[in-house]
């Protein structure tokens, strides 16, 4: 499995380096998760032809995956640090059920899927420390999540492959937009 951020050989070799700031730690954590997603996407794309499908064709799905919109304050027009941070944390919490679904969906990258899931939990904790307005963050309902997970796991093989691909692609896009916004904060 990949080594978590802050534990790579470069860090060990440089013990006198300044400790990472909160922002640097978040940045590194997101890049680590993106690396994990990249590895998972490789396996998915090798297994099926989903990756060749156009975005438009894949858009016809009933998954309610979190996505950044103008109103979320994470883009340059209408940028709002607090609103954006709430959206990032809320979105990551909503992605957790989909990351749970990804477990057992990979053969050669099983540990990688677990690493992405666990690293996301750590990222959420980092971000919650940064947020001032934690009251505005809505946590998904566990019962709703449980029934969603059951529904997703009951799909046929083709739909499960499609779902896996869509989750990875959407999660990657969400993290990219999140990190770009965080780099402005």
């Amino acid at each position: 499995a990949p080594v978590p951020p802050g534990e790579d050989s470069k860090d060990v070799a440089a013990p006198h380096r300044q400790p990472l700031t909160s922002s640097e730690r978040i940045d590194k954590q997101i890049r680590y998760i993106l690396d994990g997603i990249s590895a998972l996407r490789k396996e998915t794309c090798n297994k099926s032809n989903m990756c060749e499908s156009s975005k438009e064709a894949l858009a016809e799905n009933n998954l309610n995956l979190p996505k950044m919109a103008e109103k979320d304050g994470c883009f340059q027009s209408g940028f709002n640090e607090e609103t954006c941070l709430v959206k990032i944390i809320t979105g990551l919490l909503e992605f957790e059920v989909y990351l749970e679904y990804l477990q057992n969906r990979f053969e050669s990258s099983e540990e990688q899927a677990r690493a992405v899931q666990m690293s996301t939990k750590v990222l959420i904790q980092f971000l919650q420390k940064k947020a001032k307005n934690l009251d505005a963050i809505t946590t998904p309902d566990p019962t709703t999540n449980a029934s969603l997970l059951t529904k997703l796991q009951a799909q046929n093989q083709w739909l499960q492959d499609m779902t896996t691909h869509l989750i990875l692609r959407s999660f990657k896009e969400f993290l990219q937009s999140s990190l770009r916004a965080l780099r402005q904060m």
């Epitope: 890049r31 990657k172 896009e173 990219q176 937009s177 990190l179 770009r180 780099r183 402005q184």
Partner: nanobody, 124 residues
Framework: EVQLVESGGGLVQPGGSLKLSCTTS????????VGWFRQAPGKEREFVAD????????WYAESVLGRFTISRDNAKNTVYLEMDGLKPEDTAVYYC?????????????????WGQGTQVTVSS
């Protein structure tokens, strides 16, 4: 890393326009974020604009907002910087840079590949 080549620079009068291109032969260029930076003589290199892997995710420096437009054509492995209403203070060497994570940002450290630069001179 990807090899980046900038082109399109030149001499232009104040109020004029130029379109810079940043091209690569790299296979997965569409997955990279690309940023434009500039460096005027005797000054620090500064952020101009960037575009994410998702083309709708663009950011601009305050000084160029509304005058410059960044865009990408993944089929041509090229990112463009259209510069309108050019001012003498836009004179600089313009560099493009790529970020393999598809994110970008307004600091040089976020990018892992750099081009050699193209000169833009705004003068009458």
């Amino acid at each position: 890393e990807v090899q980046l080549v900038e082109s399109g620079g030149g001499l232009v009068q104040p109020g004029g326009s130029l379109k810079l291109s940043c091209t690569t032969s790299g296979r997965r260029f569409s997955e990279y974020a690309v940023g434009w930076f500039r460096q005027a003589p005797g000054k620090e290199r500064e952020f101009v604009a960037d575009i994410g892997e998702q083309a709708e995710n663009t950011w601009y420096a305050e000084s160029v907002l509304g005058r410059f437009t960044i865009s990408r054509d993944n089929a041509k492995n090229t990112v463009y910087l259209e510069m309108d209403g050019l001012k003498p203070e836009d004179t600089a060497v313009y560099y493009c840079a790529a970020d393999k994570y598809g994110v970008g940002g307004n600091a040089q450290g976020y990018y892992d590949s750099w081009g050699q630069g193209t000169q833009v001179t705004v003068s009458s």
